[in-house]
Interface confidence: low
């Protein structure tokens, strides 16, 4: 038997979740804008056709999408983290980030939350995104389990302006494929993820168009095995 056959046999026998899949959203979104946030997030006040909602719907339909675990949304976790009074902290001497488990001299950020949504305003949003992405979840009972460093430290790109404002660029949302045992599973999973991403791209750009800001973005999926199976999707047309 080939090593590939053996690999599939072991997968079949021992694995209960598939490879990670990353849905990458290219830069261009203004995440500090509430309407834009509602196109991405997955909790109350978010759009029913938001990115998070569609990824959740995809996870509920694994036979077609091959998604076994819905991607977590850094944006929703950031909202939750910012609403907890003692999770965001700073050093008063230079206003730099302070871990949530530190006491004096660190102080609570006191993030101002606005509207029914209870989200940070635009300035506060950009001010504290880097703090969230540096904060390590605390499991000792403080309630600050939503710190974003572990889950999203690599998932959110941002550029700093004026030392205090972070403009979020490209981001990714990591989920997991279902268990993939055969070649058919692998290229079907690639196809399914591309269809989900195409729907996300179309929805986001349609909604952005209504904002009249001229931005277009792209959502594409990535998993380690895609490069080996891309040719399967075009094999028949290519041979004709």
């Amino acid at each position: 038997d080939s090593f590939q056959t053996k690999y599939f046999q072991y997968l079949n026998r021992y694995l209960n979740i598939g490879p990670p899949v990353y849905f990458v959203v290219t830069e261009g979104l203004n995440y500090s804008d509430m309407d834009t946030q509602n196109m991405i997030c997955g909790t109350r006040f978010c759009r029913p056709d938001s990115l998070s909602m569609q990824l959740y719907a995809a996870y509920r339909n694994p036979n077609e999408t091959y998604i076994a675990q819905p991607p977590n949304s850094w944006l929703d976790d950031y909202f939750d983290w910012s609403a907890l009074p003692n999770c965001c902290k700073y050093f008063p001497s230079n206003s730099s980030f302070c871990p949530n488990d530190r006491g004096a001299p660190c102080k609570a950020c006191g993030i101002a939350l606005e509207g029914d949504e209870q989200r940070p305003n635009s300035t506060e949003f950009e001010r504290y995104v880097p703090f969230f992405l540096q904060d390590i979840p605390d499991t000792s009972g403080s309630g600050c389990v939503k710190g974003g460093h572990a889950a999203y430290g690599q998932a959110v790109n941002y550029k700093m302006f004026n030392k205090t404002q972070a403009h979020v660029g490209a981001t990714y949302y990591q989920g997991y494929h279902t268990v993939l045992k055969t070649s058919l599973d692998y290229y079907s999973a690639l196809k399914g993820a591309r269809e989900v991403a195409a729907n996300l791209t179309e929805t986001l750009n349609r909604n952005l168009k209504h904002q009249l800001n001229g931005t277009t973005i792209n959502v594409f999926p990535y998993s380690v095995f895609y490069v080996f199976y891309e040719q399967y999707l075009t094999m028949w047309p290519d041979t004709l």
């Epitope: 109350r44 978010c46 909602m53 959740y56 719907a57």
Partner: nanobody, 123 residues
Framework: QVQLQESGGGLVQPGGSLRLSCAAS????????IGWFRQAPGKERSFVAA????????YYADSLKGRFTIARDNAKSMVFLRMNNLEPEDTAVYYC????????????????WGQGTQVTVSS
């Protein structure tokens, strides 16, 4: 058994108004989000509006430009869709549907549907 019954459709001139009603029976309306969908001749069914179980959140299709309003009266087990400034493009069969997840109405069709009521906008 969950039942939804739409009423209030009919023929109306462009610029006119209608109020559609959806009567629910066989279940507790308070537990369900309700949405309105429509299907024009030769087109796919599309989302119009939704309201969550306690009426605190509503959501509308972008194309409606604020002309439609969804409301509910849980005490009477009724949901309403007020349609103002109607256009010929609004001609369709209007369906009311119920589901427990308000947030996914536009991506995942809810499980319970009425029979529909015809709305025709024509001069």
């Amino acid at each position: 058994q969950v039942q939804l019954q739409e009423s209030g459709g009919g023929l109306v001139q462009p610029g006119g108004s209608l109020r559609l009603s959806c009567a629910a029976s066989g279940f507790t309306l308070d537990d369900y989000a309700i949405g309105w969908f429509r299907q024009a001749p030769g087109k796919e069914r599309s989302f119009v509006a939704a309201i969550d179980s306690n009426g605190s959140n509503t959501y509308y299709a972008d194309s409606l430009k604020g002309r439609f309003t969804i409301a509910r009266d849980n005490a009477k087990s009724m949901v309403f869709l007020r349609m103002n400034n109607l256009e010929p493009e609004d001609t369709a069969v209007y369906y009311c549907a119920a589901g427990q997840n308000f947030w996914t109405f536009t991506t995942t069709p809810p499980p319970y549907w009425g029979q529909g009521t015809q709305v025709t906008v024509s001069s």
